[in-house]
């Protein structure tokens, strides 16, 4: 009977512990379900955010392309409506570009051609005055579009027209013959003849875009 | 004895159930911890995504404003006259004129003002590159719109804005005090400080006309 009582007491304890544990398990089960629900919500949020981010990236790419296109158009339109392209000087009916590199006469001519221009041609004393003033702060020589094969040939501009004798006197190597020909450069306001093979700065010239704007 | 055996059997069952339940609780506890960790990771992911989304939104806003500005400029430019007057160089948003006479800084400033312009202001390395290239064939100094009263004062542009220190180093008479002040000139791509009373060439600058007529 004493053993029986003791066993009954232990049984009561175990039943109590079992019930307590079952309660704990039930509570944990509910918490687990809630956690699972919360996790599902978080995953959904992540999916939504990732989708939004992807959409934003697409929109941004689109805006970026639009931007580039607009910049490109702006460059074109600006150049269209301007008498001269950027970095050129507009004077009267012409645009002038002072080269920033030194090349021989032929290479200088090519550089101008690639810019849809020709080497400098001086048609009048007004042209000469402008050029003399424009290079007044340089002591360097600048090739112009004037050359001749040898001293027995006339001085010709790139378009084949002859030099008007009253415009300026050509100094320097006027009586020299060079395999590459003799070319004219302007320096400190005076014009000189020299071997076309030498490297110098140059002046490109093209017609200004003066159609109705 | 029969009761005792029955009780013992029940006790064994209960102990077994209790152990089983304890095992279940331990397993659930581990699962819960893992779930908590996973939840923390998900929250971190959400934070990161939210931050990225915010950044993207900011970038997009910026691009959108740029776009609107470009569209606005495009509208204006589409119907505009020459961006710059004759003899000036058009580059980006500005017009530049290289003076053909030598004057002190104050006189140079007046000359620019009379042309509705100011002395050169360099805002960026791109501006500096352009100017360096534009004067590459000159060995002469050109006044720019930068000056200071004496070495204890900051270098200021004509509009009162300070010189950004990363743009260029000023050489020469930086430690000197002159009654007429100290002014900056650019020569062969470098910037020097000198007495504002000296005569030099100069560079005038004004906004290009990119507005509708």
């Amino acid at each position: 009977s004493q053993v029986s009582n003791l066993l009954k007491q232990q049984q009561t304890n175990l039943t109590h512990q079992k019930n307590k544990l079952e309660g704990q398990i039930s509570a944990r089960q509910q918490a687990e379900e809630a956690s699972q629900e919360s996790q599902n919500e978080l995953k959904e949020m992540i999916e939504t955010l990732a989708w939004k981010l992807n959409e934003k990236s697409k929109e941004q790419m689109e805006l970026h392309h639009q931007n580039l296109n607009l910049q490109e158009t702006l460059k074109r339109v600006a150049n269209c409506s301007a008498p001269c392209p950027q970095d050129w000087i507009w004077h009267e009916e012409n645009c002038y570009l002072f080269s920033t590199g030194s090349f021989n006469w032929e290479k200088s001519q090519e550089k101008c051609l690639s810019l849809d221009a020709k080497l400098l041609k001086i048609n009048s004393t007004a042209d000469l005055d402008f050029i003399q003033q424009a290079i007044s702060y340089s002591s360097f020589p600048f090739w112009m579009g004037l050359s001749r094969r040898n001293p027995s040939y006339p001085w010709l501009w790139e378009d084949g027209s002859p030099l008007m004798p009253h415009l300026f006197r050509i100094r320097g190597a006027v009586s020299q013959t060079y395999p590459s020909g003799t070319c004219a450069y302007i320096q400190r306001g005076a014009v000189y003849a020299e071997n076309c093979i030498l490297a110098a700065f140059s002046i490109c010239q093209k017609k200004a875009n003066l159609r109705a704007q | 004895s029969q009761v005792s055996n029955l009780l013992k059997q029940q006790q064994t069952n209960l102990t077994h159930q209790k152990n089983k339940l304890e095992g279940q609780i331990s397993a659930r506890q581990q699962a819960e911890e893992a779930s908590q960790e996973s939840q923390n990771e998900l929250k971190e992911m959400i934070e990161t995504l939210a931050w990225k989304l915010n950044e993207k939104s900011k970038e997009q806003m910026e691009l959108h404003h740029q776009n609107l500005n470009l569209q606005e400029t495009l509208k204006r430019v589409a119907n505009c006259s020459a961006p710059c007057p004759q003899d000036w160089i058009w580059h980006e948003e500005n017009c530049y004129l290289f003076s053909t006479g030598s004057f002190n800084w104050e006189k140079s400033q007046e000359k620019c003002l009379s042309l509705d312009a100011k002395l050169l202001k360099i805002n960026s390395t791109a501006d500096l590159d352009f100017i360096q290239q534009a004067i590459s064939y000159s060995s002469f100094p050109f006044w720019m719109g930068l000056s200071r009263r004496n070495p204890s004062y900051p270098w200021l542009w004509e509009d009162g804005s300070p010189l950004m220190p990363h743009l260029f180093r000023i050489r020469g008479a930086v430690s000197q005090t002159y009654p007429s002040g100290t002014c900056a000139y650019i020569q062969r791509g470098a910037v020097y400080a000198e007495n504002c009373i000296l005569a030099a060439f100069s560079i005038c600058q004004k906004k290009a006309n990119l507005r509708a007529q």
Epitope: - | N104, F140, R171, G172, Y185, I197
Partner: antibody, heavy 119, light 111 residues
Amino acid sequence: QVQLLESGGGLVQPGGSLRLSCAASGFTFSDYALHWVRQAPGKGLEWVSVISYAGGFKFYADSVKGRFTISRDNSKNTLYLQMNSLRAEDTAVYYCARSPGLTSYHDSWGQGTLVTVSS
Amino acid sequence: QSVLTQPPSVSGAPGQRVTISCSGSSSNIGSNYVSWYQQLPGTAPKLLIHSSSHRPSGVPDRFSGSKSGTSASLAITGLQAEDEADYYCQSWDYESERVVFGGGTKLTVLG
């Protein structure tokens, strides 16, 4: 230790040429303007010419304009004075002097080199 | 004929105070600073005063400079035997774009 050392002086006939040099050390050469100043025997100081940091500004006394040329080589830390069409009145000790500003004071001087123009 | 005018000579006894004047015009002293140089016999000139009144380090405070209008002056107090030398004033003339010197003043320390 700032040092300026002139050389190239000597005896030359009227109408002749001479090139003076001034070797500099002990400072950042390109941060200073450089002058030539001369002193005829028993006379006072006479300024001859100045050149700015990179040679952008060059000024001359009226008495030497068109005959003398100032130049500098910043890579060699050297100042030069090319003297052509020399006259008897160019006879003097020629000093090179350093200036922290083109129009400011001469804070260091060389010891000078004597140029004698005589037939 | 120098652009800046100085007295050819001045003298004073040891311990005394002497001043050397330098007169110019509006295009030099009037619009620019003045420098003073000391030249001891047989040596190169040495900077004594710059920016009209500034003394370089190493120059005794017995030497002082001042400027007023188109004139400047150098004052030496507590005269010493080693101060016997030639003294030159110098400025920049913006009209002629050149450095201008005075003709020099010979300082004699008596006794």
